[in-house]
Structures are given as C-alpha cells and as structure tokens.
Amino acid sequence: QRFAQAQQQLPLESLGWDVAELQLNHTGPQQDPRLYWQGGPALGRSFLHGPELDKGQLRIHRDGIYMVHIQVTLAICSSTTASRHHPTTLAVGICSPASRSISLLRLSFHQGCTIASQRLTPLARGDTLCTNLTGTLLPSRNTDETFFGVQWVRP
Amino acid sequence: QRFAQAQQQLPLESLGWDVAELQLNHTGPQQDPRLYWQGGPALGRSFLHGPELDKGQLRIHRDGIYMVHIQVTLAICSSTTASRHHPTTLAVGICSPASRSISLLRLSFHQGCTIASQRLTPLARGDTLCTNLTGTLLPSRNTDETFFGVQWVRP
Amino acid sequence: QRFAQAQQQLPLESLGWDVAELQLNHTGPQQDPRLYWQGGPALGRSFLHGPELDKGQLRIHRDGIYMVHIQVTLAICSSTTASRHHPTTLAVGICSPASRSISLLRLSFHQGCTIASQRLTPLARGDTLCTNLTGTLLPSRNTDETFFGVQWVRP
C-alpha cells in the first residue's frame, strides 16, 4: 500500500519515464538535410514527456540509456524512383553539443520507399538529436508513415 | 527492504507492465484485409499479460503510452512477386471504438518481402488494434517471420 | 521520499533493468554463419548491463520478457548485389542450451542492403542468443549500421 501511494505521489518524471514521439513538421532548405519535427496532443498522437524540441530538433533532458526509433517514408515513391534517386540515406545522430557529435543510426532506401529501425544508446542531458535525410526525395508527412521517438529505458 | 517487499507483493499488473506478443492465426476471407492473431504459452513463445484477444484482434486493458511493433513476411515472395503485386500494404490502427478509429503505422512492401516497424502511441482501455494487409499476397505463419506486439511504457 | 530513497539504495540490477547493445566484432570462418559481437564503453556506445558475452554471443542473466532488436547492413551492397546474392538471410535465435534452441526472428535481404526488426520474447537465465547471417555477403562493421541489443521488459 505504502509503495503504491508513494508511486502515485511521485511525479512520473522522477521515475525517469521520459518519452517522446514526434511527427514531421517540415524539411529544411536545399542545403539543410535535417528533418524538422513537432509534437503535442493538439497535433494528434505525438507528445513530449521530458524531452523538448529546439527549433524542430529533439533535446534530451535526462541522462540515461534510451531506445531511439524512427520510420521515414518517401512521399512520391516507387521502387524505380528510389533506385533512380539512390543514394537516399537517413541518419540519426547527436548533432549538439559538437563535442558529442556522432551518428547513431543510418539506413539507405535502395529500392524501398520506407526505412524503419531502432536502437539502444546512451544519451545525456542537453544532447540534441538530428535526423538527416540526404538526397533529393522528400519525406511523407503522414503521421502513420513518418515518425521519430525516444524512450528512456534506464540510468 | 520495504520497497523490495512491496514490489514483490503488488501484482505486476498494478505496476502497469501490460505486454503482449502474438503470432498469426489466420487471414480472413478475400474481402476482409484483417490479420487474425493468437497468443498463449501453449502456442509457443506468444503471450498476453494484460491485453486480450477479441476475435483475433488485440484489445487494450490499460490506458497509457505503448510501444507497438510488428513484422510481417509474405509467404510466397521474391522481389519480383512483391513488385508485381504492388501495392501490398500493412497498416496497424485502432479499429474500435469507431470514434477513435485511426491508422497508427503504415508500410508498403514495394520490392521487399518483409516489413518491420515500431512506434510509441497513446492507447486507452477498450481500444482494439487491427492489422490490415491489403493486396492478394498472403503472410507467412512462421512464428519467427510474422508477429505483432505491444508493450506498456508509461501512463 | 522513502520510496525514492529505497529506489536509489537498491542496485539497478535488482529492479531487473538488464540491457545490452552490441556492435559487430567479426564474422566467423566460412562454415560458421554466426556474427560475433562486442560491447563496452571503451568501444564507443555499446554496453552490457546484466547480460554477458560468451565467445562473442550474448548470454542472458535474468529470466523475463525481453525486447530483442537488431539491424544489419551489408558491407558492399547495392540492390543488384543483394538480389544477385539472394538468399541472404539473418536469423536471431536461442542457440544454447540445445534443449531451448529456436529461431526467434528471421529476415531476408531480397533487394535491400539493410534489415532491421525487433520483437518481444521470453528468455531465461543462461539462454545464449546467436545471430546467423547466411549467404556470401559480409556485414558492415560501422556502429551506426550494424548493432544488436536486448532490453529486459518484465518478469
């Protein structure tokens, strides 16, 4: 009983349950390969509980090991489009602070129009994650086709 | 010590650890795109702890944010089969109650024979998830090739 | 307050937060389809908290339901390479003890150069997971392209 009460009284954030699921807001100008994300209940099924958005990029607020996952679908795409525009590549990485810059997850589209993957990685408070889509093809903004999220797993 | 004892005394369900991993039972008749799932230790490595099956569809018993994941492999498939039968598409969504009907996750096979993805999404008690495979190709029933699951992550 | 203190005093391992994320060390000789993994902070962003490596294979230390995930990218690959060398298949399974040997997750590359998937599965203390890559193509050792991990989810 005491544990159950304590669990209810403590804010969820103190249990380390940071989590976010984002939907695509927009792509950058020609020279900027980054995808810009948005989240919040007003937008549908996206949300941020702990992490924050900084100019469309996801900033971590709690140290720990996170499960990072992403799916990106190309907007106007067939297997011939994908192969003709190859290489189209999606990379998720820490883009700031610069001292911690690293690529965490990378996939190419080849003859497919969707990539989806996930991985566990240590992240620190202040790490900003960027998702770079290189190539000329544009991502779909459909919320069931393109999304990006993180889930705190353990300290 | 007190916390450890309390944790052991509380049923797991009260900690919100709802989780399910399902294997394919069967496909519907021609006009029904839904996949019908089954789970339980007698069937192998599938299980339901919290969620339930309602006529082969997964029904949620606890409000919260869930990680939903799926992999579907086509039974008789090569890259030429997949492209010739295009579009073959897999969509996971809330199909009931009708007021909450929405597509959560969508992927096309293009020239591939397997799709796999995952996402975080809020689900409510009573939500039923349906997995629709549109097209003429049939999914593999091998338990290491086709599976569908959810994991409660936080309130 | 009492719960928060207790939580801090208990070792994380007692909460069942076993987790590992591995990077590719090397492939085996011609007749051995297994991938050999490595992990640890000295190697970059890979780690083992609970599970252990036994000759490059991942051994589980705690009973429970785990989320198993993997991504493998082929090293020198285009869609034509992948289709010409078909079938190239990745399977994750329990390889020891022999009495529990089973394939958990299987994907073919077809015309793609990367596979990525995840699933929930019960694992027991002492289970060793093997990842078999069949075919003649070699995997990339880039840490953002090829990785394998597990996360304890619940008892």
Partner: nanobody
C-alpha cells in the same frame, strides 16, 4: 494424428498436364492452410502454392498462371492442377496440412518428371 498421401505424379512430356491429389486420413476442416511444396534434386524445398481456409490462394512466380490449387473439405482432399509443364517442374511434390495451433502434417511425396 492425420496422415497425408499424395498421388497423381508420373512422367509427362513438356507442355502436358497432371493433377496431383493429397488425401487426408482425417478431416481437413481444421486446416488453416494447405500447401504444395516441391524439391528438385540438389535444391531446397520450395513452397509452390497455398490455399487458406477462407479460399484465398497464392502461387510461386515460377508456376503462376500454370498451376491451380484447390481443396475439397468434403472429400478431405487437396489438389494441384499442373498445366503446360516444363522440365524445370521436375521434382518430388509434397503436400502440407497446417493446423491453427501450428501442428503441421506432411505427405511422403510424389515424383513428377517432365521429359521428352
């Protein structure tokens, strides 16, 4: 314990036809799927055709448009009608009965040889 027995194989000239049958010793009504496989010498067993309990069918690229799978629950029999046969169709053909609970039953096979 269901037992399956294939029949209908034999020697046929290229362009010819054969109809394979697979008869079950018990009811096939509980089969979620019934399938025909084939195995040519020195090759892996290949899934050729599927019919589901709902009547849906799928075929391998190599036989699509030439082979037709069907099932007759009343006769506890699965069929494979093979038309316009080619030398590369030469193989041992096996039927498989797959129950909802993942219990599978296999036949012992029937040889099909396509040669002039």
């Amino acid at each position: 314990q269901v037992q399956l027995q294939e029949s209908g194989g034999g020697l046929v000239q290229p362009g010819g036809s054969l109809r394979l049958s697979c008869t079950a010793s018990g009811s096939i009504f509980s089969a979620t799927r019934m399938e025909w496989y084939r195995q040519a010498p020195g090759k892996q067993r290949e899934l050729v055709a599927i019919v589901t309990s709902g009547g849906r069918t799928n075929y391998a690229d190599s036989v699509n448009g030439r082979f037709t799978i069907s099932r007759d629950n009343a006769k506890n029999t699965l069929y494979l009608q093979m038309n316009n046969l080619k030398p590369e169709d030469t193989a041992v053909y096996y039927c498989k009965f797959e129950r909802y609970d993942y219990v599978n039953y296999w036949g012992r096979g029937t040889q099909v040889t396509v040669s002039s």
